[in-house]
Interface confidence: low
């Protein structure tokens, strides 16, 4: 067995993907490991090969079906195991009884686009991707705007406490390049976390009209 501290964290994207990260201090880099998913009330089971993402952590995605298929429900429990090969055997290195709708992380929002841009404001819309119909409107969003000379970490967060797939950014500077990102989170789930940030959308405000007070 491999000694050391182990951490095994997984999230369900609400449709057909469970993403897992396993961290193990002192684990052997050349050991072949996989995640095995065994639902309590489904006829299928699934595995994925853990691939290294850093010195002591590995990640993989359990693809449960077509991207928009609803493979699990709020009553499912999936036993997730990290199995590592030791000779001819697979040894269980970590195990958890995973409640998918208590451990949600949605896909990043997609299809960001500028609906309308002016000198001081910009209206932006987006779409959510592979989100379960179970949520209905029970989603929230965070958005941030990168302005010149600043970093993403410095950007103030704008919170939308409802399923609103657009925003009107105000008090922008004319003729200035900005970038915009948004992320989404269901209200459901004790261990639910924010989605990754969307791909940045670059846009430029219109220049102020000559001879006019801006």
């Amino acid at each position: 067995a491999v000694n050391g501290t182990s951490q095994f964290t997984c999230f369900y994207n609400s449709r057909a993907n469970i993403s897992c990260v396993w961290s193990q201090d002192g684990a052997l880099q050349d050991t072949s490991c996989q995640v095995h998913a065994w639902p309590d009330r489904r006829r299928w089971n699934q595995t994925c090969e853990l691939l290294p993402v850093s010195q002591a952590s590995w990640a993989c995605n359990l693809i449960l079906g077509a991207p928009d298929s609803q493979k699990l429900t709020t009553v499912d429990i999936v036993t997730l195991r990290v199995l590592c090969r030791e000779g001819v055997r697979w040894r269980v290195m970590a195990i958890q009884d995973f409640k998918p709708f208590e451990n949600l992380r949605l896909m990043a929002p997609i299809s960001l686009q500028v609906v309308h841009v002016e000198t001081h404001r910009c209206n932006i819309s987006w779409e959510i991707s592979q989100a379960s119909h179970y949520f209905e409107r029970h989603l929230e969003f965070e958005a941030r705007t990168l302005s010149p000379g600043h970093t993403w970490e410095e950007a103030p967060l704008l919170t939308l406490k409802q399923k609103q797939e657009w925003i009107c950014l105000e008090t922008l500077t004319p003729d200035t390049q900005y970038e915009f990102q948004v992320r989404v989170k269901p209200l459901q789930g004790e261990f639910t976390t924010w989605s990754p940030w969307s791909q940045p959308l670059a846009f430029r405000t219109k220049p102020a009209a000559l001879g006019k007070d801006t």
Partner: nanobody
Framework: EVQLVESGGGLVQAGESLRLSCAAS????????MAWFRRTPGKEREFVTI????????EYVDSVKGRFTVSRDNAKNTVYLQMNSLKPEDTAVYYC????????????????WGQGTQVTVSS
Amino acid sequence: EVQLVESGGGLVQAGESLRLSCAASGQYFSTYSMAWFRRTPGKEREFVTIISESGGIKEYVDSVKGRFTVSRDNAKNTVYLQMNSLKPEDTAVYYCAAARDWFARNEYQYDYWGQGTQVTVSS
């Protein structure tokens, strides 16, 4: 160390039912995954079904799905295999197996085995 003893085998007609039991002695029965395998003459031992430590997770080989049901009673240190609608091709020696830390369908992954019980299904 775990000892496993199967019982309940016998000779039945096609379409009838049998219930196999596997009694375990030793500690920590509830920490073992339990499986049933079967062997027909001249063939490899074949995975039939598995039940997880708590009994919440079960899986079956396709050929027995809908006919066989595995269960366990951790208070009695026993695992059961209810076999309904038996067919002649179910004729085999049935073995129960216990795995600590191992969870799979391959026989080499199981640490403890019973001696087997014969099931014969006549047409």
